[in-house]
Interface confidence: low
């Protein structure tokens, strides 16, 4: 007989990412003799809520706690038996929720109601159900890149921990009602809601990050509808031939589409809207998002919020990713450019309905929404947050690190549980990110 | 509750200078800038400039720069501001005031939610 | 820098009377914040954000506008509300204030 040597006990922790459109559930995993070291813990599994988001249940706030069931379900497999006492499940919702608390904030307080008493039933450490802030949102985002891209410290061949020399990556989310900015800056922020600064191992960050609500695909999505409704009775993203029934009360109830709103409409009217495949109407509906009018600071991105140089490399992940993966997986069209980004999306946008769904095969969903969105991603970047050529040759656009998925939950989770220490390895203790 | 707190009244002499404060309690001095406004008797107000707490930032209406100094002590929690090489075009009230903002449609909406009584500088000979 | 120019200057009203003080400016403006300053006291915020009622003040106030015309209406003018108003801007350094209105109750 030999000696086998037993693998690691595991440690588990589960977030659910309740964002505006759906809901996601993410198993993270970590050794347990090493809950302190860098780049450890790791997604164990995945799952996708059914339906819309928490937030589509403002109505119906029992619906909301039952569409997490299946999920539940899924964890109690996942995660061994004996671990599910000390597994920590939280739960985070995004600006979808924000704009329900900011419209009808008792609805809102009942969805999370609902979501805890649900949650409290299963067998984990439930830690709570809470609305994050664009700025956590932002932040959470940016420590999960660094994290699994192992920037904020290394184990060295020599059998000590460095900070890597290549410095931490900006971090950009785009959800589906709002987007967040995040990078690491060293003046101070003149905006101070706008700065956060960290602890982690030992080193002192100083981050710039701002989340703009409304500013999520969905939501500038339903923007745009609401401006093509208002000054020209047609669409000039959509592409030509594609023709549907718009429900008034849809466009309009978003508090996003307030300021367009008539002042006397029937929410409940059908109005017939179809595409023009126009890319300069297309881009000019999309300008009108942004205003550079007015700044109360030395520099501003757009709408008066102020923003410094962006700086370093950059990880734009969720819609950004999946916009540009479309354009380029999709459409085979190049986009290592913001040139070729700009030329891409006037490519969508110039194909007709036809065109389009004969180069997509398999009617991809929202597939007449491919322009607006690859116009908005094209203008937020280089318009809105000031990315010159140089800036965006150092943007990835990426999905996963580490087999892991990039966005705020698995930083949001890293935090509540201290994995990562303030202080440098050796000393064992937490981080507060308040 | 949150409350900015000046002194009264400041009888000073041409050509010199005088420094009011203004102490803030009932929040974290540090998570908002200071802004002073000018209110001249008889008539409307006038931005002079802010500090930021935190670093120390500040920013000026340009008809105040040279005229107006805007520091902070953190420790106590108070803002000051000194006016300089005084005129009777500087008699009037001045104000200090939080600027609140109102994070929405990702604009940051900027405004004045909590002044002080107000410092009732008098400058004569 | 922008100009703010309320009108009118003085206005008369008597109790429970509608009114609606303007503030129209020399460029367009984002947004318009209002306030409120009754004699010997410092000014209060009334209204933020062109249409925004800051907390605890009465619905009987209400604020709109856009570009370069906002107005301030009281549906049922009350004694309380005798008072001097200034419209403010924030969208271009730097922030000015109108000349104000005083509202006299009869």
């Known amino acids: 007989t030999r000696d086998v040597r037993e693998p690691p006990a595991l440690k588990y922790g589960i977030v659910l990412d309740a964002g505006s459109s759906h809901t996601s559930m993410f198993i993270y995993k970590w050794p347990a003799d090493k809950e302190n070291d860098t780049g450890i813990v790791g997604q164990h599994s995945s799952c996708d809520v059914p339906g819309g988001g928490i937030s589509s249940y403002a109505d119906n706030p029992s619906g909301a706690s039952q569409s997490l069931v299946g999920c539940l379900e899924q964890a109690l497999q996942d995660v061994p038996k004996e671990r599910h006492a000390g597994t920590p499940l939280y739960l985070g919702a995004t600006a979808g929720m924000r704009l329900l608390n900011l419209t009808n904030p008792e609805a809102s307080t009942s969805v999370l109601m609902a979501v805890t008493h649900t949650l409290t039933q299963y067998p984990f450490d439930f830690r709570g159900a809470r609305i994050l802030s664009g700025q956590e949102e932002g932040v959470f985002g940016w420590v999960t890149a660094n994290y699994l891209l192992e920037n904020f410290i290394k184990y060295g061949w020599v059998g000590r921990w460095f900070r890597p020399r290549k410095g931490t990556l900006g971090a950009m989310d785009l959800g589906g009602a709002s987007t967040q900015i995040t990078f690491e800056t060293t003046s101070p922020a003149e905006d101070r809601a706008s700065e956060v600064q960290l602890h982690l191992y030992g080193q002192h960050y100083r981050v710039y990050t701002h989340s703009f609500l409304c500013y999520g695909r969905d939501q500038v999505l339903q923007r745009l509808l609401a401006s093509a409704l208002q000054t020209h009775g047609f669409h000039p993203c959509w592409p030509r031939g594609f023709s549907t029934q718009v429900l008034l009360g849809d466009v309009y109830q978003s508090p996003c589409t307030m300021a367009q709103r008539p002042q006397n409409f029937n929410s409940s009217a059908r109005v017939s809207l179809s595409g023009s495949s126009d890319p300069h109407l297309c881009r000019d509906l999309v300008s009108g998002l942004f205003s550079f009018s007015s700044c109360p600071f030395s520099r501003c991105s757009f709408n008066g919020v102020f923003q410094p140089p962006v700086a370093g490399n950059f990880v734009a992940f969720s819609a950004f990713f999946y916009t540009v993966d479309f354009l380029r997986t999709s459409m085979g069209l190049p986009v290592a450019t913001l040139q070729q980004l700009e030329a891409a999306a006037v490519n969508v946008c110039n194909q007709t309905w036809a065109q389009l769904q004969a180069r997509v095969p398999g009617q991809r969903a929202r597939l007449a929404d491919y322009c607006a969105g690859a116009m908005f991603v094209q203008q937020l970047l280089s318009r809105g947050y000031g990315f010159d050529e140089r800036a965006f040759g150092g943007v990835i656009f990426q999905k996963k690190a580490a087999d892991t998925a990039v966005g705020w939950a698995l930083g949001y989770m890293l935090n509540l549980t201290n994995l990562i220490p303030a202080d440098p390895p050796g000393l064992r203790k937490g981080t507060d990110f308040s | 509750e949150v409350q900015l707190q000046q002194f009264g009244a400041e009888l000073v002499k041409p050509g010199t200078s005088v420094k009011i404060s203004c102490k803030a309690s009932?929040?974290?001095?540090?998570?908002?800038?200071m802004d002073w406004v000018k209110q001249s008797h008889g008539k409307s107000l006038e931005w002079i400039g802010d500090?930021?707490?935190?670093?120390?930032?500040?920013t000026y209406n340009q008809r105040f720069k040279g005229k107006a100094t805007l520091t902070v002590d953190k420790s106590s929690s108070t803002a000051y501001m000194e006016l300089r090489s005084l005129t009777s075009e500087d008699t009037a009230v001045y104000y200090c005031?939080?600027?609140?903002?109102?994070?929405?449609?990702?604009?940051?909406?900027?405004?004045?939610?909590?002044w002080g009584a107000g410092t009732t500088v008098t400058v004569s000979s | 820098q922008i100009v703010l120019t309320q009108s009118p200057t003085i206005m008369s009203a008597s109790l429970g009377e509608e009114i609606t003080l303007t503030c129209s400016a020399s460029?367009?403006?984002?947004?318009m914040h209002w306030y409120q300053q009754k004699s010997g006291t410092s000014p209060k915020l009334l209204i933020y954000s062109t249409s925004n009622l800051a907390s605890g003040v009465p619905s009987r106030f209400s604020g709109s506008g856009s570009g370069t015309f906002y107005s301030l209406t009281i549906s049922s003018v009350e004694a309380e509300d005798a008072a001097d108003y200034y419209c403010?801007?924030?969208?271009?350094?730097?922030?000015?204030f109108g000349g104000g209105t005083k509202l006299e109750i009869k």
């Open positions: 005031a939080r600027r609140g903002f109102f994070p929405y449609y990702g604009n940051s909406y900027y405004y004045f939610d909590v």
């Open positions: 403010h801007q924030w969208s271009n350094y730097p922030w000015t």
């Open positions: 500090i930021n707490p935190n670093y120390d930032i500040t």
């Open positions: 460029s367009s403006v984002s947004y």
């Open positions: 009932g929040y974290t001095f540090t998570d908002y800038n």
